[in-house]
């Protein structure tokens, strides 16, 4: 069947070999069955990405505890639900603890390092700089357009996009979601932020969907720089020597 594909994740292999000939899709790199009606978890997406590589003033000040993803790509360990395992290690037995977004939140150690829990990232601050425009975007229009985007494209419940700040040419999008607020079917802010980040970079994860084309009253929003800050429910545990900015 040519229509056996995963609309929300192009990094999958799909077939109709399952019970009753139902279309089933598995994430590349992990072979985990994914739900194609919603976003795939960031952990499985990162794992798929790594497997593919192997084969071929109104603005918010980020909190002092906010962390940037300085380490970039790695091949993560995911649990049976596709979430990041608390402890991640590389091939040379260097290990570290991560948050629910998969970003390192401790110093690196050896295999004796203990990570008791996956600390939830409950606040994500996405900071964008847009390309030149002859007129600044209307804040209200920009706010509406970005809220529509997160709700319609990423299926994020509107209550989890807490604010859109704008001070030309910088846009900040605040996503907030406590563990107690997230329902079973709710998209995780970590996954919505990752899909958005990939869209902004022109690397859409959606199958066959045209790239991101955000327009505010007819003016296209061209993003030329992105920074994403992650704030966890518990402060990160870095030693004092790690005081360099991301």
């Amino acid at each position: 069947q040519s229509n056996c594909t995963c609309p929300t994740n192009k990094m999958t292999v799909c077939d109709t070999n399952g019970p009753g000939g139902v279309c089933q899709c598995r994430a590349m790199g992990s072979q985990v069955l994914v739900d194609c009606s919603t976003l795939t978890s960031k952990c499985l997406l990162l794992k798929a990405r790594m497997s593919a590589r192997k084969s071929g003033r109104s603005l918010v000040m980020p909190s002092e505890h906010a962390i940037l993803d300085n380490d970039g790509l790695y091949d993560p360990e995911c649990d049976d639900k596709g979430r990041f395992k608390a402890r991640q290690c590389n091939q040379t037995s260097v290990c570290w603890c991560v948050n629910s977004v998969g970003v390192r939140r401790t110093d690196k150690g050896d295999q004796s390092l203990r990570c008791d829990e996956v600390v939830r990232t409950h606040h994500i601050l996405i900071e964008l700089r847009h390309r030149p425009t002859d007129r600044a975007f209307n804040h209200s229009d920009l706010d509406s357009e970005l809220r529509r985007l997160f709700q319609e494209r990423y299926k994020l419940h509107p209550s989890f996009l807490s604010a859109v700040h704008y001070e030309e040419p910088t846009i900040q999008i605040e996503l907030r979601q406590n563990a107690s607020q997230k329902g079973l079917r709710d998209v995780d802010i970590a996954d919505a932020a990752y899909y958005f980040e990939r869209d902004i970079k022109g690397e859409s994860l959606f199958m066959g969907r045209r790239g991101l084309d955000v327009q505010v009253r007819g003016e296209p929003l061209h993003v030329e720089r992105t920074l994403i800050y992650y704030l966890d429910e518990k402060p990160p545990q870095f030693s004092m020597k790690r005081l360099t900015a991301g």
Partner: antibody, heavy 123, light 109 residues
Amino acid sequence: AVTLDESGGGLQTPGGALSLVCKGSGFTFSSYAMGWVRQAPGKGLEYVAAISSGSSTGYGAAVKGRATISKDTGQSTVRLQLNNLRAEDTATYYCAKSGYGGSASYVSDIDAWGHGTEVIVSS
Amino acid sequence: ALALTQPSSVSANPGETVEITCSGGGDYYGTYYYGWYQQKAPGSAPVTVIYDNTKRPSNIPSRFSGSTSGSTNTLTITGVQADDEAVYYCGSYDSSAGIFGAGTTLTVL
């Protein structure tokens, strides 16, 4: 392939009006800023006017107050109207396409040019 | 009004690397934007070799590159060829209007 075809040039009389049209093809016309750049004989390039995808406009100092730039997205055309023509408006006029849509002012974004249409203002 | 500054002429032997600088463009919240346009003969249509500081159209050879340091942009032609002989104009922005430099004539010896 992106193509930009200018028309409307030729011999014009001082004090008269000029209307140049550029038709674009091979790209989504509505998504990009478009503009006009001219070159007088023996001189360098000069920004004339541009219009963003959202229809905001910009004009060069030499034509401000005399020029109007507009577009017809349905026809994929951009038009330059230049009134009160002077001898110094004599030049080859090039249609230019921006690689982006948001600004009419950044000639740093031009990624494609037309072949040009020659305008001579003389009595 | 701002004025873009670029050298009036540069020359090089085939195979050498040529750098042409352009400065004086307006900034958009601390970032400067430049483009480079090649014109082989007066009255012939310009060709974009670099736009948006570093981007190269798909039809332009990889020997052309652009880089920005502060408010200055540099067009670099690595391994210059006889066919690269032309006038190179830089373009930027000045308070709601585009501006061009006076042009740099590249002579390939």
